[in-house]
Interface confidence: low
């Protein structure tokens, strides 16, 4: 029997990835640095399918349903050229609410649709965050 890889304590496993949900308030870049500090090649999480989004949303809803959460999607050139910080392809999209723009160049999972959809926000906002690595 193939054994499932184990995740760091407090992290959860889904389809070959480990996820850590941190209820600390960090701006986007500090959140990314903190994810990296946990090692294992961790970054702010990329979300690449509806299945992955649903699993994450279900997990987080067990803790809270009101605070948005940083994910690893950002627009570093501030020209709506969104990219995942871990280098994943930006193909799956789940934007909600009003379309992106203004000074909002970092993406969060939005609490007003049970974390299934994303909003853009100002990167200096301090919020909870989600990290991800492949064990």
């Amino acid at each position: 029997q193939i054994q499932r890889p184990s995740c760091a304590p407090g992290w959860f496993y889904h389809k070959s990835n480990c996820y850590g949900y941190f209820r600390k308030l960090r701006n986007w870049s500090d959140a990314e640095l903190e994810c990296q500090s946990y090692g294992n090649g961790a970054h702010l999480a990329s979300i690449l399918s509806l299945k992955e989004a649903s699993t994450i949303a279900e997990y987080i809803s067990g803790y809270q349903r009101s605070q948005p959460i940083w994910i690893g999607l950002h627009d570093p050139q501030k020209r709506q050229q969104w990219q995942w910080i871990d280098g994943a392809m930006y193909l799956y999209r789940s934007w909600s609410g009003k379309s992106m723009g203004g000074n909002k160049h970092c993406a969060e999972m939005s609490s007003n649709n049970n974390f299934l959809t994303w909003s853009s926000n100002e990167c200096n906002k301090r919020q909870h965050f989600l990290c991800k690595y492949r064990p």
Partner: antibody, heavy 121, light 107 residues
Framework: EIQLQQSGTELVRPGALVKLSCKAS????????INWLKQRPEQGLEWIGW????????VFDPKFQDKAILTADTSSNTVCLQLSSLTSEDTSVYYC??????????????WGQGTLVTVSA | DIQLTQSPASLSVSVGETVTITCRAS??????FAWYQQTQGKSPQLLVH???SLADGVPSRFSGSGSGTQYFLRIDSLQSEDLGIYYC?????????FGGGTKLEIK
């Protein structure tokens, strides 16, 4: 019902400036990005830029950066486009439009009726 | 900036026929793409968003297809009210750009 009512036709002198308005009804402008577009006579459409009325952030096509100023007044639910140093090249119909959310692919789902600006001595 | 090349520039078609308009993007725009119709003296009207989804109230004889850099608008069983100019537009990044338009005339 979402509506965008634009101000009336303008005849202006070269070198002058003009301010066009777009009054929204049926929705709060803070909930959308308000875009402006240009259409020269018998020609295609050009995107000028957008404003986020929630915080007055703007994004422009670089070629309009020095020509256009976008402002928003949330109390009257109105957005304005100011065009400066007008030349005959600015003679066009100008439209305001709102982008839908990402379920709509971010497309321009609602448009104003357009304002004709004619620049002539 | 992303260029959109639309073809044909114009076409003349009889009522009841099928029309296909093509729009080619200079790079992959991942279906961040829309089609509009503009009739004489009116504002453009959204027909298709997300490359394939019909906007509210648009007749089912209109359909969008394509992906990557190549997109198509098809009009089946053309009606006289379909005359006008059709534009494609991308939303992949700013500045948003439009195709040059396709003028559709009824024979």
């Amino acid at each position: 019902e979402i509506q965008l009512q634009q101000s009336g036709t303008e005849l202006v002198r070269p070198g002058a400036l003009v301010k066009l308005s777009c009054k929204a009804s049926g929705f709060n402008i803070r909930d959308y990005y308000i875009n402006w577009l240009k259409q020269r006579p018998e020609q295609g459409l050009e995107w000028i830029g957008w404003i986020d009325p929630e915080n007055d952030d703007t994004v422009f096509d670089p070629k309009f950066q020095d020509k256009a100023i976008l402002t928003a007044d949330t109390s009257s639910n109105t957005v304005c486009l100011q065009l400066s140093s007008l030349t005959s090249e600015d003679t066009s119909v100008y439209y305001c439009a709102i982008k839908g959310n990402y379920y709509d692919g971010g497309a321009f789902a609602n448009w104003g009726q357009g304002t004709l600006v004619t620049v002539s001595a | 900036d992303i260029q959109l090349t639309q073809s044909p520039a114009s076409l003349s078609v009889s009522v009841g026929e099928t029309v296909t308009i093509t729009c080619r993007a200079s790079e992959n725009i991942y279906s961040n793409f829309a089609w509009y119709q503009q009739t004489q003296g009116k504002s453009p009207q959204l027909l298709v968003h997300g490359a394939t989804s019909l906007a509210d109230g648009v007749p089912s004889r209109f359909s969008g297809s394509g992906s990557g850099t190549q997109y198509f608008l098809r009009i089946d069983s053309l009606q006289s009210e379909d005359l006008g100019i059709y534009y494609c537009q991308h939303f992949w990044n700013t500045p948003y750009t439009f195709g040059g338009g396709t003028k559709l005339e009824i024979k």
